[in-house]
Amino acid sequence: HTTVDTSGLLQHVKFQSSNFENILTWDGGPASTSDTVYSVEYKKYGERKWLAKAGCQRITQKFCNLTMETRNHTEFYYAKVTAVSAGGPPVTKMTDRFSSLQHTTIKPPDVTCIPKVRSIQMLVHPTLTPVLSEDGHQLTLEEIFHDLFYRLELHVNHTYQMHLEGKQREYEFLGLTPDTEFLGSITILTPILSKESAPYVCRVKTLPDRTWAYS
């Protein structure tokens, strides 16, 4: 490794980002104690002045929500944490360069799975992010990632699957057997930045075919 670290008071300062919610996290290290307090600062790439994050000064928890401070998804940011423990000198560590566009992971989509007699409908709900457009409205994942598409799978049994893919939000798997349980999975993909969400999974049973009862 290229760094010899002997401070022991503060380690692993990094951003954890999901759907553009950007949380700064860190570990205390072996020398930290219950009275160790942490203060957080942040800045944009190329800026000289570090800005103190209100609400994250002399705190004891090991995380700080910097979503609002880092909400420009085309910008690069840094954050740093200063740890102070009674009787010892302060220790400061900074993050690597952070871009939410590059580094955020995508959560599973929010999906409604609707069973019918011989089909299953899947409705994908738009995912709002904290990212703002120029006119101030919250952007959806689809608006940020223009190449975003959905991959849907329906597991009929252990050996047979049906597949659908697309950019639209409404899908229907047709030609299914009534009164049968199926396992659906829906994944978000953004190929340009090689992002892939974990799947949303729904277990759903087609409705029984009642038509014979009335013939």
């Epitope: 290229t2 760094t3 300062v13 790439y45 190329g46 690069f76 740093k80 400061t92 900074m94 360069r97």
Partner: antibody, heavy 116, light 113 residues
């Protein structure tokens, strides 16, 4: 007051190795990125690479990748440039310089001469 | 790599006169997120390390005399010394920090006529 002081330069034979040091004072080295820049005699400036002293993450100019390695010892508040397989054209003054984009503080430089 | 080309290579200016140095980049240095240009200027005197004068193309570094100013956008930039002083004799470099590897111009030597 921020100060950067390089050391470790000198005469080395072609094919040899050298490790340069950059001792930082007046601030914690983990609070800003550190870079190495070189300047051949009578020539311009050439960026070698950078390190985030907190994480050890490095970015190099492709020209130097493989032969040159940047590292940090946080306890000594010091950055290093390890140079291997040195050639005559590596003869230059080597500077460490602080910051992540442009460079606000520079050391005085240390001269490396590669000659047989 | 982004290539930085300065002109002229050297210039001689009378004391009190204006000195103008140009720097051209092989691609735009306009940083879309803040609409600023990722360009810095340095002054280097003989036997000394470079000294930061200007960053973001036009922001003057603290302590730098106001006779130094930077301008330009996109690919064309200028460093102007409005009234040359004897202590301004040096080599001046531009540097881009738009993308890796960071690159410098070849330098412009400013002398007194």
């Amino acid at each position: 007051e921020v100060q950067l002081v390089e050391s470790g330069g000198g005469l080395v034979q072609p094919g040899g190795s050298l490790r340069l040091s950059c001792a930082a004072s007046g601030y914690s080295i983990t609070a800003e990125y550190m870079n190495w820049v070189r300047q051949a005699p009578g020539k311009g400036l050439e960026w070698i690479g950078e390190i985030n002293p907190s994480t050890g993450t490095t970015t190099y100019n492709q020209k130097f990748k493989g032969r040159f390695t940047i590292s940090v010892d946080q306890s000594k508040n010091t950055a290093y440039l390890q140079m291997n397989s040195l050639r005559a054209e590596d003869t230059a003054v080597y500077y460490c310089a602080r910051f992540d984009a442009y460079f606000d503080y520079w050391g005085q430089g240390t001269l490396v001469t590669v000659s047989s | 790599d982004i290539v930085m080309t300065q002109s002229p290579d050297s210039l001689a200016v009378s004391l009190g006169e204006r000195a103008t140095i140009n720097c051209k980049s092989s691609q735009s240095l306009l940083y879309s997120s803040n609409q600023k240009n990722t360009l810095a200027w340095y002054q280097q005197k003989p036997g000394q390390p470079p000294k930061l004068l200007i960053y973001w193309a036009s922001s003057r570094e603290s302590g730098v005399p106001d006779r130094f100013s930077g301008s330009g956008s996109g690919t064309d930039f200028t460093l102007t010394i409005s009234s040359l002083q004897a202590e301004d004799v040096a080599v001046y470099y531009c540097q881009q920090y738009y993308s890796y590897p960071f690159t410098f111009g070849q330098g412009t030597k400013v002398e007194i006529k």
